[in-house]
Interface confidence: medium
Amino acid sequence: LYFSRDAYWEKLYVDQPAGTPLLYVHALRDAPEEVPSFRLGQHLYGTYRTRLHENNWICIQEDTGLLYLNRSLDRSSWEKLSGRNRGFPLLTVYLKVFLSPTSLREGECQWPGCARVYFSFFNTSFPACTSLKPRELCFPETRPSFRIRENRPPGTFHQFRLLPVQFLCPNISVAYRLLEGEGLPFRCAPDSLEVSTRWALDREQREKYELVAVCTVHAGAREEVVMVPFPVTVYDEDDSAPTFPAGVDTASAVVEFKRKEDTVVATLRVFDADVVPASGELVRRYTSTLLPGDTWTQQTFRVEHWPNETSVQANGSFVRATVHDYRLVLNRNLSISENRTMQLAVLVNDSDFQGPGAGVLLLHFNVSVLPVSLHLPSSYSLSVSRRARRFAQIGKVCVENCQAFSGINVQYELHSSGANCSTLGVVTSAEDTSGILFVNDTKALRRPKCAELHYMVVATNHQTSRQAQAQLLVTVEGLYVAEEAGCPLSCAVSKRRPECEECGGLGSPTGRCEWRQGDGKGITRNFSTCSPSTKTCPDGHCDVVETQDINICPQDCLRGSIVGGHEPGEPRGIKAGYGTCNCFPEEEKCFCEPEDIQDPLCDELCREQKLISEEDLGGEQKLISEEDLHHHHHH
């Protein structure tokens, strides 16, 4: 047995006479032989579930579910209840109604075996019948919605009449009907005004019925019509077996460059027309088992279950269903020397499915693990400026397919042929297994005899000791210019373009900082800032070279505070900033502030475009359009 609603609403007035019927509660059957029996909870509850008093006023007919006033609720009773409501005005009280047999202990009230009946209390007597509006004569203030389980016997789940109105205003005639399309499984009995299902419902055919209840009020010569929504939701049970969409029960996959733990190797999809078990229970009741194979397979792979709700079309309406993705996942990093082929089977069991048929499927995965060889190009050729500052990134080395690698460890080393000309360093990028070449020793750059730098690049996978080698020729270009005395270590400190471009800073390949002009669109990833190289900084990512010194790119790497409009980076730096962002690495602070536009007035020379002077932009000259100007003014 279950209630067709989890909550009911009615009004209560002071001194309403004993014997006044209030409302019916309805139970629906789970099995044809069940007979409902209703029981009221012992207490009345108020605001925040406060237990107010033993219920001495309202009774229920155990067999019909009719709630009625056993005795009148007078003003003194009401004041007594109000005094116990934690100081809140008592506007609503509620009772719990249970379906027997249930435990006699009055605990939590949870659907389906318990419903709450809420009474809106009015500290006045019942209004004169003539003063009631048609809406008040027809329907409760709170619109009901109904829950009906699929595949269950049909039954009565609602009664339209407002019983207190019918009892106290017998001269007012109220008629009801349901507006519904042809062939819908509901009927409203014209005599009893009971609404019932004609037959058992199938949620997989239709999940929601948006009906309309029509009430016609006759009071003397007056006839008025009131319409309200009458929604019915069909509740699911596990009556559908899992199936393979398009019959696909096998997936084939090759493991080559992606060898990292947690890599998804292949996915097979299972469809289930049901949406039960509910998400909390789903993984426990919808099981997947990797069938025993050899030890290596059991250690190397696991199956992950990813259920997702979806919508499917049935009889012209959409109903929810579930797709279950079963992912074959690497349980550990695979060595680049690993080379084998295997077949895996996964047993999926919808353990709640009762038939007909089986709730079990067998998934098949064919997997080939291929070995990876390390190859480098025969040689690299790069150039570097004599003015480059320490930590300037000048290029990358990368074994074949390194961009596609994950879970493959490659370490790069540089071996210099000229000991006094060892200018460069190399670090392995965690992102793409490439080696980033950077300036490590600026003194060597200045030596006249170091015009050409010769290196051997060695890439090693330490797990297997496999190696690859390549020649690297670096040409040193340009004339050395001494670093300016008044310049900061970090490009990022400069707040304005002229300050930025007159200095160099750590990480600068040209020996000069670069100004990145932002797009001016509020808090944006493309904020204005001063950088050693706009190719690498800021790009929302603190790379392996930038981690070597906070002065290189605090915009990406700072862990300190950011003042002003911004979105912080994860786990550090500035993901997005407002206007111009500059940073003070020693103080572990960045500032993001509006660009300094003050006086964008125009003369005859600049109708289409406006040249905003350095004064207006705080040290920067820039052509901006009417639209930009409006945007800056607006901000």
Partner: antibody, heavy 125, light 107 residues
């Protein structure tokens, strides 16, 4: 030793144009973080910033005087020139030039660390 | 333009006194503020940059503090040579602006 010296006419007539020159020594006008500002001070009144030129030749001006001011520099002569048009008796003041540069140790922050002695300009018919 | 309001406009103090001058900006200027001392007939002299950084060669009795909109110049023990007019200057936003000055006189 860093020095700045202002030069220009002592007396100008109303509506005339004033040309002031600041000759610097001990640093280069093209060095990074080396800029020069002009500031004036009417008799018995507060200082007022007029204009600035950066080492990169970018310029900036006081909003209220922008239409009357022009600043420029000649790096080879180590000179910064301020031209002020349409002079008026209220422009009577001592005019200073000052070097604006960054301060050690981090070279983050700026200050006008060296000033000229100033040149007094009287506007009268 | 950002207004810089200095207070008091003038003050009388004795040698050895602790003197505090404040400067308030009409909007936040971070710490982009300098303090300058000017004696009659002389050019101003930079005392403090970045609100609190003492210029080399300036006696340690001078100190600066503050950030955002409120700034203070403190002379911990006034000396005879400190009687002068003091100005604050913001160079956070164009146009750069000076305060109206505080004249420190001998009581």
């Amino acid at each position: 030793q860093v020095t700045l010296k202002e030069s220009g006419p002592v007396l100008v007539k109303p509506t005339e144009t004033l040309t002031l020159t600041c000759t610097v020594s001990g640093f280069s006008l093209s060095s990074a973080r080396m800029g020069v500002s002009w500031i004036r001070q009417p008799p018995g009144k507060a200082l007022e910033w007029l204009a600035h030129i950066f080492s990169t030749d970018e310029k900036s001006y006081s909003t209220s005087l922008k239409s009357r001011l022009s600043i420029s520099k000649d790096t080879s002569l180590s000179q910064v020139v301020l031209i002020m048009t349409n002079m008026d008796p209220v422009d009577t003041a001592t005019y200073y030039c000052a070097r604006r540069t960054t301060m050690a140790p981090y070279y983050y922050y700026y200050g006008m660390d060296v000033w000229g002695h100033g040149t007094t300009v009287t506007v009268s018919s | 333009a950002i207004q810089m309001t200095q207070s008091p406009a003038s003050l009388s103090a004795s040698v050895g006194d602790r003197v505090t001058i404040t400067c308030r900006a009409s909007q936040g200027i971070r710490n982009d503020l300098g303090w300058y001392q000017q004696k009659p007939g002389k050019a101003p002299k930079l005392l403090i940059s970045a609100a609190s950084s003492l210029q080399s060669g300036v006696p340690s009795r001078f100190s600066g503090s503050g950030s955002g909109t409120d700034f203070t110049l403190t002379i911990s023990s006034l000396q005879p040579e400190d009687f002068a007019t003091y100005y604050c200057l913001q160079d956070y936003k164009y146009p750069w602006t000076f305060g109206q000055g505080t004249k420190v006189e001998i009581k």
